[in-house]
Amino acid sequence: ITQQDLAPQQRAAPQQKRSSPSEGLCPPGHHISEDGRDCISCKYGQDYSTHWNDLLFCLRCTRCDSGEVELSPCTTTRNTVCQCEEGTFREEDSPEMCRKCRTGCPRGMVKVGDCTPWSDIECVHKESGTKHSGEVPAVEETVTSSPGTPASPCS
């Protein structure tokens, strides 16, 4: 997911509808004016705000990367929702990119969970039921795998 290209200092002057802040805050879909007197609406498809706020600028909409699909567009009150394409997933510890799901489990393991946009396939040992760490398995150890992928330890 990437931020919009427009740099903060290059943004055009807002021409949006204005209203007054309530106790110094503006509603979702707005930001506060430079003198704090008005609430200015965010620009649809360009920026947004999700909460009551005193932000001087609305938050820039994110754009889905290649390898992602847009589940819902950016509105003035909600950011774009992007999801990894089928066959890929995004881990919590590396959210910046979608990774390819493994095509199979190492020998001696069985698949208990499918590839989803949020997780790789899940493998467990046939006997013990211990989960596999999630690294891509070595070719010689796999039931079904793409060539050249490195081995991984089991937990």
């Epitope: 110094g24 706020n53 001087l56 938050l59 820039r60 994110t62």
Partner: nanobody, 128 residues
Framework: EVQLLESGGGEVQPGGSLRLSCAAS????????MGWFRQAPGKGREFVSA????????YYAESVKGRFTISRDNAKNTLYLQMSSLRAEDTAVYYC?????????????????????WGQGTLVTVKP
């Protein structure tokens, strides 16, 4: 608690330039998201410019864009505001401020109107 001390104000003719400085102490300067605000006589506080702790995200009020430049020197614990092509309407007390509850989204800093730590201000007067 961070303390801020502005300097560099004074009287200048229209079209002239000034450089304001804000020295910070009592905190790790490189972790502070900061900004400049101003208050003209008989008027309310107005946002001028803001800069993220890294200096990567910079914002300006429409009224000063192209004339003012914000910068920081983390090694010197100092925030700057270079003001050029000054106009009579720029006359105000200029305040350096720290955003102690910064908003970050997608790694980008977004300034607020309600900065919470303030300096004592420095007066800038623009008159012929």
């Amino acid at each position: 608690e961070v303390q801020l001390l502005e300097s560099g104000g004074g009287e200048v003719q229209p079209g002239g330039s000034l450089r304001l400085s804000c020295a910070a102490s009592g905190s790790t300067f490189s972790s502070l998201d900061m900004g400049w605000f101003r208050q003209a006589p008989g008027k309310g506080r107005e946002f001028v410019s803001a800069i993220s702790r890294s200096g990567d995200n910079i914002y300006y009020a429409e009224s000063v864009k192209g004339r003012f430049t914000i910068s920081r020197d983390n090694a010197k614990n100092t925030l700057y505001l270079q003001m050029s092509s000054l106009r009579a309407e720029d006359t105000a007390v200029y305040y350096c401020a720290v955003d102690s509850q910064p908003t970050y989204s997608g790694g980008v800093y977004y300034p607020r109107y309600g900065y919470d730590v303030w300096g004592q201000g420095t007066l800038v007067t623009v008159k012929p």
